[in-house]
Each structure stands twice: as structure tokens, then as C-alpha cells.
Interface confidence: low
């Protein structure tokens, strides 16, 4: 695959984990617990999130309360959000570095700055797919303990929300497509052949550039 | 070999007390819940209380509250319960169990403690 | 509290049948998280303390001969014993462990 399309296709990936990350960092369903209330009929459902809290009941009404002081948030809420919105600030200034980097743009001239520029853009999109998963993971292992501590009631036990799947998705997208923009800029930099032919002369040489290792996918 | 042998039962009068103890052996005590399970004379089990790996957090059956204590020592790999204000229906074998995800894996042998007058 | 129904409370067996004992809870035990149904089975013979033979519906306890089969989900769960040997002849308690308070059935007594 040439190292334009290898380019797209990991930019692409890595818009729709981008937009997956958002999703995951504003919906309320990190943690989801459904229990019957004992004093009334209805079942309901209570979803917790970064930023706030809604119960749900078996009649569809849904009311959400935003989480009033930072103070008051634990530990873990206060981490996650900072880690998330880290990750989405982070993939947001690794759009306009793969955007300078990237071979259909003339931002950067052509040559191995280009490449590093598009490197740059690849590596800082894995990082931010690392990042977005250390507040996933660490949820999720709460959560996780919580269900099994014998000492938590069950209306204190939740079980993993759907904003966690979307998150773990979101971030392997972001890995991924981070991997193979750090290919793209590899085989642009070793391969010149490969590359989109462009209208500027200057030199190519291949550089020593990090090679991707398919063991950093998660 | 898991091992769990529960000490300290015995006849008491109604409104005294009793503590219970529970020596664990085979198995890295503080790795797992603990908990008491009883058995009144002919009669099914029923759950006592529960304590967490460091001892931080206990929670206890609805007949017994206010009036037992749960409690471990983890460098004595000990297990113990201590009943206050004792009553005729908690004339039961106090069995001590291992705790892991919120079932009872291995229990003690059971010690009879008998509450009467 | 969620309570623990068990039927019957005694049933008279004979070796080499296979016995279906019945529990049922007033609340589902299944997780849609984990997709699991917590509930554990127990066998306790005349003077010795109750074994682990099955948790989380179906999961066997290792050691535990695989004649015993837990099944089951949400609030109807069955323990069958296939070809029931001598030793088998016990009380047999079912426990929900899916919330404080842990409770058990009441027993199903399996005599001669």
C-alpha cells in the first residue's frame, strides 16, 4: 500500500476514534447499575459519567443531575476527566501535525522534515490513544472491584457502561490509525517510489525513523 | 491445604459475651474476604458477617448488627468475631469461611456456641 | 433481602438415579454486565461442615466430580446429581451471592 493511502486510511481511523473519545468523555455511562427499588414498582436505571449522573426509569423518563463541585468528585472522576480531555485536546493538535505532515498538504515542504512532521503526527496519536486508555482501564478495574466487594450494597454496585466499550474502540482506532501514520511517514521517508509523485525536487533520502511494532496495538 | 479452625466457643449466659477466633493456614489471608457463617441446631445456614482484606471495611447480617464485631489480624492470620449482648437464638456452630467473589469456598470445621441461662 | 427458595425440602433417593433439586430467587441474580447468574450450591453431610460444589450458577469447584451440574439464570436454578452414589446423600443448600445480605435456601435433604 502506498504511503498516501496508508496516510488516509490512519487519518480516517484516527478521526473516528477521535470522535469515538468525545463520545466515551461526554456520555454519562461509565458505570450503569439497574436494581429494583423496593419502596416503588418501577425498575430503574442510574448511569454515572464523567460530568454527571442520570437516573432512568423503566417508563423512559430519564433525569440527569451535573456533578456540582469539583471538590466534592473523587479522586477517580477527577483523574479521568483530566486524562480524557488530555487525550482529546492531544488528538486535536495531532490532526493539524498530520495535516502539515501529510503528503496532499504544503504546509512543510516535501522531504524528510515532511516525514517527521507526519511521524510526529502518527506517534502523538498513539500516545493519545495510551492516554485515553489508562482512565478507561482504571475505571473499569474500579468498577470491576466494586461489583465483587462484599461490603458494597447493591444499590452502590455498578456494572461497565457503554461509554467504556466505545472508549476501548475509540482508542484502539486511535492506535491504529496512529500505527499506520507512522508507517505512512516510514515507507515516505525509506520507499520514495511508494510515495504520491509531487511537484517540488527536493532531495529524498531515507532517514532513521522508528519502525511500528504490531506489539504496541492494544 | 486450606485450613480454617475456629476456637473460643462454648455455654454462655443470655446478655454476655463471647469472641470467636479463626486461625487460617495454607492460603495468603490477606488476599481474601473473610466472613462468619452460622447454624442453629437443625436449622440452615445463615450469613453473619463479612470483613475485607485489610480489615477497613465489615458488614454484617441484619440479626447480629449492633451487637458483633468482625475483625482479622493479618500478621496472626486470625479471623474474629466478637458477640456482645448475646441472645437464645444465637446459640448456633459459628462456622469461619474464605471469601472470594462473594461465595464461601472453605469453611471451618464450625465451633457450637450455646446461649442459655 | 433477596430470598432463596428451595424445593423439595426432602426427597427420598436410591444409588445410580439421577436428582434434580430446585432453587428459586425473589430477584434475578444475573448481571447483564458480566452476563453471569450468582448463585453458588453447597453440600454438607451429617456432621461436617458445608463444601463449595458450584458457584455462578455452573462453575464447578475443582474437585468436585462432574455428576453435579449446576444450571439455570435470573431466578430459577437447578443442581442435578447424575447417577447419585452413597456419598452423595447430604443436605444440599443453595446461596445467592449476588448482594448483602448472602442468603442460603433452607436445604433439600436427600435420604434413603
Known amino acids: 500500500m502506498g504511503s498516501a493511502a496508508l496516510e488516509i486510511l490512519g487519518l480516517v481511523l484516527c478521526l473516528v476514534g477521535w470522535g469515538g473519545l468525545i463520545l466515551a468523555c461526554g456520555l454519562p455511562m461509565w458505570q450503569v447499575t439497574a436494581f429494583l427499588d423496593h419502596n416503588i414498582v418501577t425498575a430503574q436505571t442510574t448511569w454515572k459519567g464523567l460530568w454527571m449522573s442520570c437516573v432512568v426509569q423503566s417508563t423512559g423518563h430519564m433525569q440527569c443531575k451535573v456533578y456540582d463541585s469539583v471538590l466534592a468528585l473523587s479522586t477517580e472522576v477527577q483523574a479521568a476527566r483530566a486524562l480524557t480531555v488530555g487525550a482529546v485536546l492531544l488528538a486535536f493538535v495531532a490532526l493539524f501535525v498530520t495535516l502539515a505532515g501529510a503528503q496532499c498538504t504544503t504546509c512543510v515542504a516535501p522531504g524528510p522534515a515532511k516525514a517527521r512532521v507526519a511521524l510526529t503526527g502518527g506517534v502523538l496519536y498513539l500516545l493519545c490513544g495510551l492516554l485515553a486508555l489508562v482512565p478507561l482501564c482504571w475505571f473499569a478495574n474500579i468498577v470491576v472491584r466494586e461489583f465483587y466487594d462484599p461490603s458494597v450494597p447493591v444499590s452502590q454496585k455498578y456494572e461497565l457502561g457503554a461509554a467504556l466499550y466505545i472508549g476501548w474502540a475509540a482508542t484502539a482506532l486511535l492506535m491504529v490509525g496512529g500505527g499506520l501514520l507512522c508507517c505512512g511517514a516510514w515507507v515516505c521517508t525509506s520507499r520514495p517510489d511508494l510515495s504520491f509523485p509531487v511537484k517540488y525536487s527536493a532531495p529524498r533520502r531515507p532517514t532513521a525513523t522508528g519502525d511500528y511494532d504490531k506489539k504496541n496495538y492494544v | 491445604e486450606v485450613q480454617l479452625v475456629e476456637s473460643g466457643g462454648g455455654l454462655v449466659q443470655p446478655g454476655r459475651s463471647l469472641k470467636l477466633s479463626c486461625a487460617a493456614s495454607?492460603?495468603?489471608?490477606?488476599?481474601?474476604?473473610m466472613a462468619w457463617v452460622r447454624q442453629a441446631p437443625k436449622k440452615g445456614l445463615e450469613w453473619v458477617a463479612s470483613?475485607?482484606?485489610?480489615?477497613?471495611?465489615?458488614y454484617y447480617g441484619d440479626s447480629v448488627k449492633d451487637r458483633f464485631t468482625i475483625s482479622r489480624d493479618n500478621t496472626k492470620t486470625t479471623l474474629y468475631l466478637q458477640m456482645t449482648s448475646l441472645r437464645s437464638e444465637d446459640t448456633a456452630t459459628y462456622y469461619c469461611?474464605?471469601?472470594?467473589?462473594?461465595?464461601?469456598?472453605?469453611w471451618g470445621q464450625g465451633v457450637m456456641v450455646t446461649v442459655s441461662s | 433481602d433477596i430470598v432463596m427458595t428451595q424445593s423439595p425440602s426432602s426427597l427420598a433417593v436410591s444409588a445410580g438415579e439421577t436428582v434434580t433439586i430446585n432453587c428459586k430467587s425473589s430477584r434475578s441474580l444475573f448481571s447483564s454486565g458480566y452476563q453471569e447468574n450468582y448463585l453458588a450450591w453447597y453440600q454438607q453431610k451429617p456432621g461436617q461442615s458445608p463444601k463449595m460444589l458450584i458457584y455462578?450458577?455452573?462453575t464447578r469447584e475443582s474437585g468436585v466430580p462432574d455428576r453435579f451440574i449446576g444450571s439455570g439464570s435470573g431466578t430459577d436454578f437447578t443442581l442435578t446429581i447424575n447417577t447419585l452414589q452413597a456419598e452423595d446423600l447430604a443436605i444440599y443448600y443453595c446461596?445467592?451471592?449476588?448482594?448483602?445480605?448472602?442468603?442460603f435456601g433452607a436445604g433439600t435433604k436427600l435420604e434413603l
Open positions: 455462578l450458577a455452573s
Open positions: 446461596q445467592q451471592h449476588y448482594d448483602i445480605p448472602y442468603t
Open positions: 470483613i475485607n482484606y485489610e480489615g477497613s471495611r465489615t
Open positions: 495454607g492460603f495468603t489471608f490477606s488476599d481474601y474476604f
Open positions: 469461611a474464605r471469601h472470594p467473589r462473594r461465595y464461601f469456598d472453605f
